[in-house]
């Protein structure tokens, strides 16, 4: 037996740096969707009521506690009748997989904020991206959320050579040794060591000395 007409399927969490959207299929015809997400009291909260979209932004809910394991479901109603039910007296619905933001949100592509050379040392700073996770009415950065559980790996190489080197930090700054008079290029990657999946981000865009972001001091 296939999926009944109107019932959602392929429910998928799409989440990067805690910005979290639930997606599903199919595109509706003559019916609408309503999403419910279970809160920490295991109550179902309504979101995206009566939508004809196949996605629902649940960021506002999951950022309340990023360590909580959430479950959502997509309810299907015939168009114009939010009270319509299936044969069992309930609307057709499909459950999502469980989702724990802290463990599962993808790490977004990091950005090198700046680099500064002083003699034979270069300080490379990674932008501490703001997330939508709040504490005391302020938005937390990625570092605020993950603390020492977030590592950045730096790849760097002389512009004139292909041999790369690497360094790591559990802050957002690197201090590396360079050869005087040489230009270097840099790229960073974020890692959550404690994870077993979704551990690494994509590499940041490459930034090279002699371009805008750098500063040089003798």
């Amino acid at each position: 037996a296939g999926t009944p007409p109107g019932k959602a399927f392929n429910l998928t969490w799409i989440s990067t740096d805690f910005k979290t959207i639930l997606e599903w299929q199919p595109k509706p015809t003559n019916y609408t969707y309503t999403v419910q997400i279970s809160d920490r009291s295991r109550n179902w909260k309504y979101k995206c009521t009566g939508t004809t979209d196949t996605e629902c932004d649940l960021t506002d809910e999951i950022v309340k506690d990023v360590n909580w394991t959430y479950e959502a479901r997509v309810l299907s109603y015939p168009a114009g009748n939010v009270e319509s039910t299936g044969s069992a007296g309930e609307p057709l619905y499909e459950n999502s997989p469980e989702f724990t933001p802290y463990l599962e949100t993808n790490l977004g592509q990091p950005t090198i904020q700046s680099f500064e050379q002083v003699g034979t040392k270069v300080n490379v700073t990674v932008e501490d991206e703001r997330t939508l996770v709040r504490r005391n009415n302020t938005f937390l950065s990625l570092r605020d959320v993950f603390g020492k559980d977030l590592i950045y790996t730096l790849y760097y190489w002389k512009s004139s050579s292909s041999g790369k080197k690497t360094a790591k930090t559990n802050t957002n700054e690197f201090l590396i040794d360079v050869d005087k008079g040489e230009n270097y290029c840099f790229s960073v990657q974020a890692v959550i060591p404690s994870r077993t999946v979704n551990r690494k981000s994509t590499d940041s865009p490459v930034e090279c000395m002699g371009q805008e972001k750098g500063e040089f001091r003798e």
């Epitope: 790849y155 080197k165 360094a167 790591k168 060591p193 999946v197 979704n198 551990r199 590499d203």
Partner: antibody
């Protein structure tokens, strides 16, 4: 469970090449950094280099750069070490290891390589 | 490149003794230092990571301390099964470097 199994070692003549493999199971190599480390008979551990299998980034100890090449086949969940222009001093047990970014948490059993005429 | 100087290269101690091994880095390695135990014919086994953190399943008689360039590994009460060679590894920047190793024997 997580396992790393090296293969491809053996006896080879100086100047020849050898390709070692490290088959991973219980995890996807693309989620981790992967390393090769070697140990000559009666000597200490020596780091060769690493790869990020997801993007192909490789880093080597300069003494191995150009002569040794690390690669990965994500579809086969396997790491490789291509060793060219082998010398007697390359005789060692070669280990692959998984890196969680704070430590090497799993190692293979090692595969011995002997370079001799 | 960062050099790791490990000492002593060998030491002999009695069961129950407190044993200390040191590793000195040629520059600040910001606690990116691990300690491994290796027994003959076996792969290294992680004991301590990030200079001071005990790896899962490792007995509490093993400990690590230090920061900057100076690091210490301690076995508080030596057991017969601790006979092995011990290595430090810095992984703060490439090339990663191991100490020369300390061969531990029981008198």
């Amino acid at each position: 469970q997580v396992q790393l199994v090296e293969s491809g070692g053996g006896v080879v003549q100086p100047g020849r090449s050898l390709r070692l493999s490290c088959k991973a199971s219980g995890f996807n190599i693309k989620d981790y950094y992967m390393h090769w480390v070697r140990q000559a008979p009666g000597k200490g551990l020596e780091w060769i280099g690493l790869i990020d299998p997801e993007n192909g980034n490789t880093i080597y100890d300069p003494k191995f750069q150009g002569r040794f090449t690390i690669s990965a086949d994500n579809s086969k969940n396997t790491l490789f070490l291509q060793m060219d222009s082998l010398r007697p001093e390359d005789t060692a047990v070669y280990y692959c290891a998984r890196d969680n970014s704070y430590y090497f948490d799993y190692w293979g059993q090692g595969t011995p390589v002997t370079v001799s005429s | 490149d960062i050099q790791m100087t490990q000492s002593p290269s060998s030491l002999s101690a009695s069961v129950g003794d407190r044993v200390t091994i040191t590793c000195k880095a040629s520059q600040d390695i910001r606690k990116y230092l691990n300690w491994y135990q290796q027994k003959p014919g076996k792969a290294p086994k992680l004991l301590i990571y990030y200079a001071t953190s005990l790896a899962d399943g490792v007995p509490s008689r093993f400990s690590g301390s230090g920061s900057g360039t100076d690091y210490t590994f301690t076995i508080s009460s030596l057991q017969p099964e601790d006979i092995a060679t011990y290595y430090c590894l810095q992984h703060g920047e490439s090339p990663y470097t191991f100490g020369q190793g300390t061969k531990l024997e029981i008198t």
